[in-house]
């Protein structure tokens, strides 16, 4: 995929944005108690653009497209307490904890990757 | 898919813009002369988002892209002149004529419907 | 008691997919209370985590292999089933299905495990 | 190379106790439960601990789990010919997003 697109000399004035924002995350399970963490989520503005296709093609589509995800996490365990359950009193979710976000090309998997 | 999304309770001074920017387009065919056409390319910055994601997952996975394509779009035909082939002299390509764009969802194939 | 067994092609070449299902008996794959897990050995050597999933269909990848796994559940036949792609010798190794007690790192019952050699 | 690090072998007496250790970091054991596994010759593992100290109903309580910082700790008392295996501990690590396992530890009782 083609790197990313900062800025557009036919728009110069204006610059993709892609924000790693603090959220409250709610994290619950059937028959548990939902536990509230800090967590982050990704938000913004990229950059894409569709130039007019031929057929047959001259040359490679030219579609563009970037979108805000997220560009470093880690998956932690956290644990719910399940006092109505004698079988399973606890229960292990796993939560994906946003480090930092960026504008990446549209189709690709968001990047999971450890510190 | 869910509806595009053109403004943000968190950046109410940010909007969502996707622009049809007039263009000059070469057509072009191995052998026989370009012509230049007038048309339409689609640019812009729609908004996305990814919010955290959990397994077992409580709900869908919430992540949101729009990306800047046409929302409009007939495909005409250019002749093009192939003075050097005796056989086939002249070629017929199909070009894509973009009349309006819009903030679409990112999976989506752009709308090539006539007007 | 649960039991799981491991069912599938002893011997998958080069380049092609791997595919092996867990059967499970004596308990329900739908009753919300477990996450089902494939882990591998190595010959000779430690253990590794490939993933798990839930009834629902949720599904989560050991990152490091995510890129050629898939796990998938048919709660019609109390089966889940692994798909590992473009395997190489060093995907031979003792494939085990397991169940843990919706606790992620705890694996209370094992499938006796299977040999899956990677060899053209 | 394994994340966590255990001894490859130890070796005791019968009646004498053994003690396994398994060393991490903070993104793994530093802030995540422990199970232990004993994998005898020829069969799958099989849950010895759990939550660093937990054992499952029909594990005797000559088997002993503990964590202190990065580190947990498998003991086994009044060894028997049968516990001759491999050991394993487990835990999540959340740098790398995914479950891991030591190296294992044989044990001999001698």
């Known amino acids: 995929a083609p790197p990313p697109i900062n800025k557009l000399a036919l728009f110069p004035d204006k610059s993709a944005w892609c924000e790693a924002k603090n959220i409250t995350q709610i994290v619950g399970h059937s028959g548990c108690e939902a536990k509230s963490i800090q967590n982050r989520a990704c938000l913004g503005q990229c950059f894409s653009y569709s130039v007019p296709n031929t057929f047959p093609q001259s040359t490679e589509s030219l579609v563009h497209c970037d979108s805000c995800m997220p560009a470093q996490s880690m998956w932690e365990i956290v644990t719910l307490e399940c006092p109505g359950h004698e079988e399973v009193p606890r229960v292990d979710k796993l939560v994906e904890k946003i480090v930092h976000c960026s504008c990446q090309a549209c189709g690709k998997e968001p990047s999971h990757e450890g510190l | 898919a869910p509806p595009p999304i053109n403004k943000l309770a968190l950046f109410p001074d940010k909007s969502a813009w996707c622009e049809a920017k007039n263009i000059t387009q070469i057509v072009g065919h191995s052998g026989c002369e370009a012509k230049s056409i007038q048309n339409r390319a689609c640019l812009g910055q729609c908004f996305s988002y990814s919010v955290p994601n959990t397994f077992p997952q409580s709900t869908e996975s919430l992540v949101h892209c729009d990306s800047c394509m046409p929302a409009q779009s007939m495909w005409e035909i250019v002749t093009l002149e192939c003075p050097g082939h005796e056989e086939v002299p002249r070629v017929d390509k199909l070009v894509e004529k973009i009349v309006h764009c819009s903030c679409q969802a990112c999976g989506k194939e752009p709308s090539h419907e006539g007007l | 008691e649960v039991q799981l067994l491991e069912s599938g092609p002893g011997l998958v070449k080069p380049s092609q997919t791997l595919s092996l299902t867990c059967t499970v008996s004596g308990g329900s794959i739908s009753s919300g209370g477990y996450y089902w897990s494939w882990i591998r050995q190595h010959p000779g050597k430690g253990l590794e985590w490939i993933g798990y999933?839930?009834?629902?269909?949720?599904?989560y990848y050991n990152p490091s292999l995510k890129s050629r796994v898939t796990i998938s559940v048919d709660t019609s036949k109390n089966q889940f089933s692994l798909k590992l792609s473009s395997v190489t010798a060093a995907d031979t190794a003792v494939y085990y299905c397991a169940r843990t007690n919706s606790r992620i790192t705890m694996i209370a019952d094992w499938g006796q495990g299977t040999l899956v050699t990677v060899s053209s | 190379q394994s994340v966590l690090t255990q001894p490859p072998s130890v070796s005791a007496a019968p009646g004498q106790k053994v003690t396994i250790s398994c060393s991490g970091s903070s993104s793994n054991i530093g802030n995540n439960y422990v199970s232990w596994y004993q994998q005898l010759p020829g069969t799958a593992p099989k849950l010895l601990i759990y939550?660093?100290?937990k054992r499952p109903s029909g594990i005797p309580d000559r088997f002993s789990g503990s964590k202190s910082g990065t580190s947990a700790t498998l003991g086994i008392t009044g060894l028997q010919t049968g516990d001759e295996a491999d050991y394993y501990c487990g835990t999540w690590d959340s740098s790398l997003s995914a479950g891991v396992f030591g190296g294992g530890t044989q044990l001999t009782v001698l």
């Open positions: 939550d660093n100290n």
């Open positions: 999933i839930y009834y629902s269909g949720s599904t």
